[in-house]
């Protein structure tokens, strides 16, 4: 008796963060013995969709021609071979942007900051939201969440960075999200360019998960620092 079938690989093209109205293709790759592929969406009746494999039978395509709120969520896929169903794939989180108007991103006291000083990125929404996300372009782990507790909603979140080093420089955007679903994000804010001066002398910080770095170098997650400005907001990092 062979062991359990290996789990398939699940991914989305062109990516897992899709603007409203754009197309996305979800791929599930199993083995050459696969006879059928099944895609399940969390909190939806299973199976969410079934597809026959594409030649040479080791993967299946699930097409979403126009991204809407209904498609945002957490997916897993399985394949069936002559010996039964596989283990589930690792989850794929399909996120839709454009669910809400864009927030406003600014830097306090200024987007021009001297190395070693402090700066706070402020993401503001004109309507109350319960999650704010800060994203740095070209960062390996770009997300920092500020999520409100107990459903209390806020108009803003602060992302402090201290001390600032050269690696904090770059282009940032923020998103906001409502309690309806954390897979639904706002339009992105306009980009904010953070410029760090005096950076030639800056040593590159070690890639430890130090709470002293608020939006750290490309090889570490963005990390929070300081106290939360609104007591209803709780920090999460990924």
């Amino acid at each position: 008796q062979a062991g359990p079938l290996p789990k398939p690989t699940l991914w989305a093209e062109p990516g897992s963060v899709i603007s409203w109205g754009n197309s996305v293709t979800i791929w599930c790759q199993g083995t050459l013995e696969a006879r059928e592929y099944r895609l399940d969406k969390e909190e939806s009746p299973a199976p969410w969709d079934r597809q026959n494999p594409l030649e040479p039978k080791n993967k299946a395509r699930f097409s979403i021609p126009s991204m809407t709120e209904d498609y945002a969520g957490r997916y897993r896929c399985y394949y069936r071979s002559p010996v039964g169903w596989s283990q589930p794939s690792d989850p794929l989180e399909l996120v839709m942007t454009g669910a809400y108007s864009k927030p406003t991103l600014s830097a306090l006291p200024s987007p021009l900051v001297t190395s070693g000083k402090s700066v706070t990125l402020l993401c503001q929404s004109r309507s109350p939201m319960d999650t704010f996300l800060l994203i740095k372009e070209r960062a390996a782990h770009p997300l920092l969440h500020l999520r409100s507790e107990h459903g209390a909603q806020q108009h803003q979140a602060e992302f402090p960075m201290s001390p600032v080093t050269s690696v904090h420089g770059g282009t940032y955007r923020c998103f906001s999200s409502h309690g309806f679903s954390h897979y639904l994000l706002s339009h992105p804010s306009d980009p904010l360019e953070l410029i760090v001066s005096g950076s030639l002398e800056d040593p590159r910080p070690s890639p430890t998960r130090s709470v002293s770095t608020a939006a750290g170098p490309e090889d570490q997650p963005l990390m929070p620092t300081g106290s939360v400005p609104h007591s209803g907001l709780r920090r999460h990092w990924e």
Partner: antibody
Framework: EVQLVESGGGLVQPGGSLRLSCAAS?????????ISWVRQAPGKGLEWIGS?????????YYATWVKGRFTISRDNSKNTLYLQMNSLRAEDTAVYYC???????????WGQGTLVTVSS | DIQMTQSPSTLSASVGDRVTITCRAS??????LAWYQQKPGKAPKLLIY???TLASGVPSRFSGSGSGTEFTLTISSLQPDDFATYYC????????????FGGGTKVEIK
């Protein structure tokens, strides 16, 4: 030309209903804006009625005094916003404006207004 | 709730005068305050946004200042075209608001 044009105003009896339209041109209502309805009774100040988010979810918020009598909706395919008004009273007599909230959080674009008169 | 209180409600002034209108928010609105000018029978016109930034095409005699809860609109030298009603407005949108506008200030000829 970027503009908002209201229509649908007129004379209505107390207790009646009316639907106002706000047609957007030169920009898309499904882009990243909020749109508000604002009214002004004769000789009075500006009064916010409510707003709808142009994001796909279309969140709406209303002034506390609305109490379910008014509903804001939109039709992206027609690039048009609506204000459904029910159980109208004499004190709802006003010029009704739709206005766009720009990136600066201010109302940077206004329609010309449409007059609603509630009278028997 | 955020209440916007404008003062004075009426202001009598002459051409060339320096005019100041105040708007007070019942809680901090940061810098998210706008000022509008309205003339009879017309829609309001945006003058100033983000408390102090002049909207496109607005004469430089108009200026705005303030942050948090206290804001001011100043007309440095009143012109004949400036006799109108002025409103302040905060930029937040939520479900516990009675209004987002102040009560208005009518600037009339002395």
């Amino acid at each position: 030309e970027v503009q908002l044009v209201e229509s649908g105003g007129g004379l209505v009896q107390p207790g009646g209903s009316l639907r106002l339209s706000c047609a957007a041109s030169g920009f898309s209502l499904s882009s990243s804006y909020w749109i508000s309805w604002v009214r002004q009774a004769p000789g009075k100040g500006l009064e916010w009625i409510g707003s709808i988010d142009s994001g796909s979810v279309g969140i709406t918020y209303y002034a506390t005094w609305v109490k379910g009598r008014f509903t804001i909706s939109r039709d992206n395919s027609k690039n048009t916003l609506y204000l459904q008004m029910n159980s109208l009273r004499a004190e709802d007599t006003a010029v009704y404006y739709c206005a766009r909230h720009g990136d600066n959080w201010a109302l940077d674009l206004w329609g010309q207004g449409t007059l609603v008169t509630v009278s028997s | 709730d955020i209440q916007m209180t404008q003062s004075p409600s009426t202001l009598s002034a002459s051409v060339g005068d320096r005019v100041t209108i105040t708007c007070r928010a019942s809680q901090s609105i940061n810098q998210w305050l706008a000022w509008y000018q309205q003339k009879p029978g017309k829609a309001p016109k945006l003058l100033i946004y983000k408390a102090s930034t002049l909207a496109s095409g607005v004469p430089s005699r108009f200026s705005g200042s303030g942050s948090g809860t206290e804001f001011t609109l100043t007309i440095s030298s009143l012109q004949p075209d400036d006799f109108a009603t002025y409103y302040c407005q905060h930029g937040y949108i939520r479900g516990d608001l009675d209004n987002v506008f102040g009560g208005g200030t009518k600037v009339e000829i002395k």
